[in-house]
Interface confidence: low
């Protein structure tokens, strides 16, 4: 099984980044970390989407990775998509340093994210608490600023 993966985030605008994934044991948590720049200050939704297809830009990646057919939620919620990684926080210079440990995504098995697309969004993810139908699907996180396919790393 792969123990490391990497994703280079790119978009049509200024947002770009590198995100690293590391999983030391097959059933253990995945450390997600790196840096994204070119964002507006504040929270930005951060999700793994179903398809590793960027042929028409980030929209080709489809919906959030949701093999268990659940509603959207926050990373600490029982009811969440596998791909729901919550938000990243950009500072006044537009840089978001990312450091997440998640026990639902994996680099192998049914929850494997390798070959799927990581997306950073325009707005904050409301973590499914927004009170409308869109909140239960996307967290009202808005458009897709940058994305990249998650690949196996050395």
């Amino acid at each position: 099984m792969a123990t490391k993966a990497v994703c280079v985030l790119k978009g049509d605008g200024p947002v770009q980044g590198i995100i690293n994934f590391e999983q030391k044991e097959s059933n253990g948590p995945v450390k997600v970390w790196g840096s994204i720049k070119g964002l507006t200050e504040g929270l930005h939704g951060f999700h793994v989407h179903e398809f590793g297809d960027n042929t028409a830009g980030c929209t080709s990646a489809g919906p959030h990775f949701n093999p268990l057919s659940r509603k959207h939620g926050g990373p600490k919620d029982e009811e969440r998509h596998v791909g729901d990684l919550g938000n990243v926080t950009a500072d006044k210079d537009g840089v978001a340093d990312v450091s997440i440990e998640d026990s639902v995504i994996s680099l192998s098995g049914d929850h494997c994210i390798i070959g799927r697309t990581l997306v950073v969004h325009e707005k904050a993810d409301d973590l499914g608490k927004g009170g409308n139908e869109e909140s239960t699907k996307t967290g009202n996180a808005g458009s897709r600023l940058a994305c990249g396919v998650i690949g196996i790393a050395q």
Partner: nanobody, 116 residues
């Protein structure tokens, strides 16, 4: 609020070495990840290196094999050993601490100038 203070910058010739330090005002043992960024005049800030609390390290391609990041939790200090310095390494270097959840903390920076 964690305060971060960088030191160790200076003027050095190409091929030379420097060791940057970043001392935190309180324990860093619970801080998920720590980073060194740099910003050269007129350029965007870039991530140079990072280290998580389990010892995983990340390096930008431009510094791989030349820079080494380390942390000493007992001394609440982050280090960046910089060898084989090049002109293009000239920048202000900043350390950052990222607890989980964010937001993170930033230092004020230390200047590194590579000049012959």
């Amino acid at each position: 609020q964690v305060q971060l203070v960088e030191s160790g910058g200076g003027i050095v010739q190409p091929g030379g070495s420097l060791r940057l330090s970043c001392v935190a005002s309180e324990s860093i043992s619970e801080i998920d990840a720590m980073y060194w960024h740099r910003q050269a005049p007129g350029k965007e800030r870039e991530l140079v290196a990072g280290i998580t609390n389990d010892g995983t390290r990340y390096y930008a391609d431009s510094v791989k094999g030349r820079f080494t990041i380390s942390r000493d939790n007992a001394k609440s200090t982050l280090y960046l050993q910089m060898n084989s310095l090049k002109f293009e390494d000239t920048a202000m270097y900043y350390c950052a601490a990222l607890p989980n959840p964010p937001p993170g903390y930033w230092g004020q920076g230390t200047q590194v100038t590579v000049s012959s």
